[in-house]
């Protein structure tokens, strides 16, 4: 059966300078694969969060995903601030070279509400 | 720079036991999976176990299950491997090995020989 | 279990390709260790199939496709002479494997 991305909340919200966690757990590890997150779709999504390396300011993830059976692959977003408004995925790749999107999350907007 | 030293190794009778250390430096230690590797004389590499970065999750090689455990304290950057009931068959050169992402292995250390030996 | 050819040859300067089998696409990752003296630390020089640590030579590269990865030493030099041992790990199982090495001679 072929691997799903779950993000279970459509949308959060949060307020200027507050954190924020947006949710995703997978039903499989396989095929083997980096997951990523995205603001937004398409040619002009931005990478907000690789799990594949650690310098992310802001971002870190929720749980301990070197745990080799780890399926949960949420991210905190600390500091929020206007300009991380927007909808969120949760992508998973099967590796190649390049890797190749095999799976995306329904997606989570943020709304960030005036402190 | 990423540095890994292991130490603890020496030579014990069979059925006795040892602790190996491996003191890291130049990483943020608690944000990665490690594990311990062994050489013996004249063969080639052998995985024996994995942690990951909180030490929650353990991982290990059928041969050690049971007798060896591995474990790290991150408020001291340092990994360990308990191995008890010691063979002859546990005669190597043991190294820790700092884990990619994706489980395999981007640094080594130096290794430390472990002869048992009666 | 990962196999790998006992031994290759090459002259300096050409084209050295070392092939480990025994791995399956969908849930294996596979890296490439060098070990230039028996029991001196091995040094990865490919991990992630592909991926080469920032401080080893851009001569050393990898691919993986099917059940097999490849190491390949573009315009081999003496000092690259050594065992290379091709690494798996298996998202199935959670456990890493190695090929038995390669002897790389430098003629």
């Known amino acids: 059966t072929e691997v799903k991305v779950i993000q279970p909340e459509k949308s959060v919200s949060v307020a200027a300078g507050d954190s924020t966690v947006l949710n995703c757990t997978l039903t499989s590890l396989l095929p083997v694969g980096p997951i990523r997150w995205y603001r937004g779709v398409g040619q002009s999504r931005q990478l907000i969060y690789s799990f594949t390396t650690e310098h992310f300011p802001r971002v870190t993830n929720v749980s301990d995903a070197t745990k080799r059976s780890n399926l949960d692959f949420s991210i905190r977003i600390s500091n929020v601030t206007p300009e991380d408004a927007g909808t969120y995925y949760c992508v998973k790749f099967q590796r190649g070279s390049p890797d190749t999107e095999i799976q995306s999350g329904g997606g989570t907007e943020v709304y960030v509400l005036a402190k | 720079d990423v540095q890994l030293v292991e130490s603890g190794g020496g030579v014990v009778r069979p059925g006795e036991s040892l602790r190996l250390s491996c003191a890291a430096s130049g990483f943020t230690f608690s944000s990665y999976a490690m594990s311990w590797v062994r050489q013996a004389p004249g063969k080639g590499l052998e995985w024996l176990a994995g942690?990951?970065?909180?030490?929650?999750?353990?991982y290990y090689i059928d041969s050690v299950k049971g007798r060896f455990t591995i474990s790290r304290d991150n408020s001291k950057n340092s990994l360990y491997l308990q191995m008890n009931s010691l063979t002859a068959e546990d005669t190597a050169v043991y190294y820790c090995?700092?884990?990619?992402?994706?489980?395999?292995?981007?640094?080594w250390g130096l290794g430390t020989l472990v002869t048992v030996s009666s | 279990a990962l196999t790998q050819p006992a031994s290759v040859s090459a002259n300096p300067g050409e084209t050295v390709k070392i092939t480990c089998s025994g791995g399956?696409?969908?849930?294996?990752?596979y890296g490439w260790y060098q070990q230039k003296s028996p029991g001196s630390a091995p040094v990865t020089v490919i991990?992630?199939?592909?991926k080469r640590p920032s401080d080893i030579p851009s001569r050393f590269s990898g691919s993986a496709s099917g059940s097999a990865a490849t190491l390949t030493i573009t315009g081999v030099r003496v000092e690259d002479e050594a065992v290379y041992f091709c690494?798996?790990?298996?998202?199935?199982?959670?456990?890493?494997?190695f090929g038995a090495g390669t002897t790389l001679t430098v003629l």
């Open positions: 942690i990951s970065a909180g030490g929650s999750d353990t």
């Open positions: 690494g798996a790990y298996d998202g199935r199982t959670y456990i890493n494997t």
């Open positions: 399956d696409y969908y849930s294996t990752y």
């Open positions: 090995a700092r884990e990619t992402w994706n489980h395999l292995f981007d640094y």
């Open positions: 991990h992630s199939d592909d």
